[in-house]
Interface confidence: low
């Protein structure tokens, strides 16, 4: 395509002249005359149109094709558009003297829209109002060749597509060429055909790579703020879809009662700092963008933004910090159009406490600084969760103030590894810290490969952990899986628009915070014959460390009065304890913890209960009484024996039956089983009769028993 005219990213001029006239006006970049160039030989801006006659009409022309060129070489034919009318050249014979006196000029500017979908050419007639009364039409013929290498120098007739340009205002027409994304780097060939009153003006072939002609959308989100160090930060964001980095031109003006200044800066970042800002001033800013590392077109200017500074400027205007820290505020104070000298500035806290002068610093003639040391937590005052810091002059305080938020970030994080050693649960509460509106809290952690360092510190590389608020007001976060011997350094980050604060970090080794499963197979019994409370258990499978055990036992009932017993022998699986009541039901529970003291006590095991059963033979037989009935003169009398049931403590722990042992001199010895009755009657017939009542349980008969001997003479006893 060496015959095509390469379009540049600036406005150029199409000159169309009648045949046989000298080519004095060709397309030149805007602002230069025919033989002018800049130091590197490139044309840069458009020449103003020049007319010999501004009132010429084309009334006596019909179907005349004008010769149009972009070049200043007079003797060279322009490249032709293959699709021109009937294949004619641009040079036609015109007899009219009128058209030998003028040339027809158009300004043309083309670019690829910021969305990278439409290639736009604007065609502006420099014959202002000349075509108003004619049927004025502009068409753009274009082709995106599929394969450049095999194409002829000029595409064949019929390969061009034609778009009708929208000429809503006669002097300016908009031609839109859709460009597929895949073709952005290809060469687009095109030419213009302008028709008016039967006259055809046709341009030479033009070539362009759309990607080199991008006109981005204006930058977005232009805003301004005063930085913590007192500069005005102008920032914006680049428009979407731009496939390459941009450079930006920022123009701003500062208007105050004392100074008006304007500036224009080119930057590659999306922000610009303006120093030496003044109170009570307004700053108007606009920004535009253009490709940074290649050809392109400046975007339109963004909508102007105005930022007005107050009569008192605090920087920073708000500080969020933690207890014990030191912070500083600066201020510039303007009063009645004069900046208050910094040495005259006085600082107040909450308009109630004058800040001692020893805390002031004169930064410059106009900037005063106050520093607070070793700050205490802000105490809420009604709805205010901050301290108001006022910059005042000698006579009054401005109603504006800076805000100081001081938060106690000492948040305790406690962690516990489960008995299966599969997960670690960490808990923390915000009840100790003052709530800050619109703040979020997040647990962050860093896991080291092995162990914790002596002094935990906040690691630059950390991860957030999801935590969920529980009904008890604590947040709970679960680490699963876990690395038992890795050090998990964790802290709470308070995120707020004013900045973020971190609680002091704590480091946890999952292995050191294990809460074991409770011991299993817990059994409790009172041992037969020995009469001790024997408690046995099995230690949990995890952890493998040596464990200590705690036993609690007590008489079973609604409220057990527990007694504690501790076992430090990791190998122990049972213990026997003396108890006062061998015939009561005892409840027993066991729990465990690492012997070295690390971690937590397990939950108590499910309770085990002793079963009341006979431990030993009854300690004694029952005490008994007798009633003798019958005639005192007769030798035979009825004797009734009475006794109370033996108590548990004496029966150890039950009585199955009672046995009466008799002894007489004549009949010798015999026994009678009375079952579990507590009354027995026999016939006393002999001179002497001895009876003993024995208590019998599953172990045997009582050993220590009471005897009673009946002998003559004897009287009735009631």
């Amino acid at each position: 395509f060496n015959l095509s005219y390469p379009i540049t990213p600036w406005r150029f001029k199409l000159s169309c002249m009648p045949p046989n006239s000298t080519y004095d006006y060709f397309l030149l970049p805007a602002g230069l005359s025919k033989n002018t160039s800049n130091s590197n030989g490139h044309y840069e801006t458009a020449v103003e149109p020049k007319f010999n006659s501004s009132g010429t009409h084309f009334s006596n022309l019909s179907k005349t094709t004008f010769h149009c060129c972009f070049r200043s070489e007079q003797d060279r034919n322009c490249s032709l558009c293959a699709d021109n009318i009937e294949g004619k050249t641009f040079v036609s014979t015109v007899n009219s003297l009128v058209f030998q006196q003028i040339d027809a000029n158009w300004n043309i500017q083309c670019w690829l829209k910021g969305d990278l979908k439409l290639f736009i050419c604007y065609v502006e007639s420099l014959f202002k109002n000349l075509f108003r009364n004619y049927n004025y039409k502009v068409h753009l013929l274009y082709v995106l060749p599929e394969v450049l290498e095999d194409s002829p120098l000029v595409p064949q007739k019929g390969s061009f597509q034609m778009v009708h340009c929208n000429c809503s205002v006669h002097e300016c027409c908009e031609c839109l060429v859709p460009v597929p994304t895949a073709k952005l780097n290809d060469t687009l060939l095109m030419c213009l055909k302008i028709t008016s009153g039967g006259v055809i003006f046709q341009s030479p072939l033009m070539s362009v790579q759309p990607i080199n002609m991008v006109k981005p959308d204006p930058p977005l989100g232009l805003h301004m703020e005063i930085t913590d160090d007192g500069n005005l930060k102008i920032s914006w964001s680049s428009p979407p879809l731009v496939p390459f980095p941009l450079q930006y031109q920022v123009k701003y003006s500062e208007n105050s009662t004392t100074v008006i200044r304007e500036a224009d800066k080119i930057v590659s970042a999306t922000s610009l700092l303006v120093d030496s800002i003044l109170p009570g001033s307004s700053y108007e800013v606009q920004v535009r963008g253009k490709r940074l590392d290649g050809p392109g077109i400046w975007s339109d200017w963004s909508t102007p933004r105005v930022f007005t500074t107050q009569d008192v400027i605090y920087f920073p205007p708000k500080i969020l910090t933690s207890v014990g820290s030191n912070v500083s505020f600066h201020c510039i104070y303007k009063k009645e159009n004069k900046i208050v000298p910094s040495k005259e500035i006085v600082w107040w806290m909450n308009l109630a406490e004058k800040i001692p002068q020893s805390q002031y610093d004169v930064v410059s003639d106009h900037v005063s600084k106050v520093t607070f040391f070793n700050l205490n937590e802000t105490k809420p005052r009604g709805k205010f969760t901050y301290d108001a810091v006022y910059c005042c002059n000698e006579h009054e305080c401005h109603h504006r103030y800076a805000e100081l938020y001081v938060i106690d970030v000492n948040i305790n994080i406690s962690c516990e590894t489960d008995g299966y050693l599969t997960k670690m649960t960490c808990r923390w509460s915000t009840s100790t810290i003052q709530s800050l509106a619109e703040s979020t809290l997040q647990l962050r952690y860093h896991r080291s490969s092995l162990y914790c360092s002596d002094i935990p510190s906040i690691h630059p590389i950390s991860e957030p952990k999801d935590c969920y608020l529980q009904s008890d007001g604590f947040y709970e976060c679960i680490f699963q899986p876990i690395f038992l011997l890795s050090g998990y350094t964790m802290w709470i980050r308070i995120n707020h628009s004013l900045g973020s604060l971190d609680s002091p970090p704590t480091c946890v080794l999952p292995d050191s915070v294990v809460k074991p499963l409770p011991p299993s197979s817990v059994k409790a019994e009172i041992t037969i014959n020995i009469g001790l409370l024997k408690i046995s258990w099995e230690k949990p499978v995890f952890p493998e460390n040596n464990l200590q055990f705690q036993i609690r036992y007590g008489l079973s009932g609604k409220e057990v009065q527990w007694k504690m017993y501790e076992v430090y022998d990791a190998k122990s699986k049972s213990v026997s304890l003396p108890v006062p009541d061998l015939c009561a039901v005892y409840a027993v529970q066991v729990r465990c913890k690492r012997l070295d003291g690390l971690g937590y006590w397990s939950n108590w095991s499910n309770p085990a209960y002793t079963v009341v059963m006979d431990i030993k033979v009854p300690m004694r037989g029952p005490e008994f009484w007798r009633i003798i009935n019958g005639d005192t003169m007769k030798k035979e009398k009825n004797v009734t024996l009475l006794w109370k049931p033996l108590m548990k403590n004496d029966s150890l722990c039950s009585v199955q039956r009672y046995v009466i042992n008799h002894h007489t001199s004549c009949n010798g010895t015999w026994s009678e089983d009375v079952g579990n009755h507590t009354k027995f009657t026999f016939l006393w017939t002999e001179q002497a009769h001895t009876v003993t009542v024995l208590a019998i349980n599953s172990i045997g008969a009582s050993v220590a028993n009471f005897n009673l001997t009946f002998s003559w003479p004897m009287s009735k006893v009631n």
Partner: antibody, heavy 120, light 107 residues
């Protein structure tokens, strides 16, 4: 010579209103904060209200906030105290006092005082 | 609010005596304290500010000292015109409270 002259005191019923004035001379009035300080009969001094030189900032003691309003007219070199919803405990001699200038409620000149009696 | 407590409330002294009045603040007020003198039927008069700075025109027999919570006003040699009531005032915290006063009487 600095002079401060209070006026407007008198007898008023509880719930009533009074407006005290303090005419200042001998100094650049608009450059200094001014205050009202009162003294109940036989009692000590109590700071009541203050206003900055330009009149842009005002502060009052809790005991009078919402009832008393301090103001100034720099063109007339005059300080005012509008007292509404007066109570018996507001009975006192009211002094107007000139701030030394540091906006630190340090009073280097005082008026002779005007007596306000609130009684039914 | 800051409470300012003066002691003694009454003080009897003779001309030529050295007199000391104490003022205590319920919390630290740095050196933001002033002393005033008031004679019966008259307005108060500023004597000392920032705890120890003598107001211009005040005789040098008056002096002040202290910082934090405890302050003193000293009259090195009492003169007949010094019999009056003396008030301290804290200037550090709203509402800029005064002490209850110390009356210096002729013995």
């Amino acid at each position: 010579e600095v002079q401060l002259l209070e006026s407007g005191g008198g007898l008023v019923q509880p719930g009533g209103s009074l407006r005290l004035s303090c005419a200042a001379s001998g100094f650049t009035f608009s450059s200094f904060a001014m205050s009202w300080v009162r003294q109940a009969p036989g009692k000590g001094l109590e700071w009541v209200s203050a206003i900055s030189g330009s009149g842009g900032s005002t502060y009052s003691a809790d005991s009078v906030r919402g009832r008393f309003t301090i103001s100034r007219d720099n063109s007339k070199n005059t300080l005012y105290l509008q007292m509404n919803s007066l109570r018996a405990e507001d009975t006192a001699v009211y002094y107007c006092a000139k701030d030394q200038g540091d906006w630190d409620f340090l009073f280097d000149y005082w008026g002779q005082g005007t007596l306000v009696t609130v009684s039914s | 609010d800051i409470q300012m407590t003066q002691s003694p409330s009454f003080l009897s002294a003779s001309v030529g005596d050295r007199v000391t009045i104490t003022c205590r603040a319920s919390q630290g007020i740095s050196s933001s304290l002033a002393w005033y003198q008031q004679k019966p039927g008259k307005a108060p008069k500023l004597l000392i500010y920032t705890a120890s700075t003598l107001q211009s025109g005040v005789p040098s027999r008056f002096s002040g000292s202290g910082s934090g919570t405890e302050f003193t006003l000293t009259i090195s040699s009492l003169q007949p015109e010094d019999f009056a009531t003396y008030y301290c005032q804290q200037l550090n915290y709203y509402p800029f409270s005064f002490g209850q006063g110390t009356k210096v009487e002729i013995k």
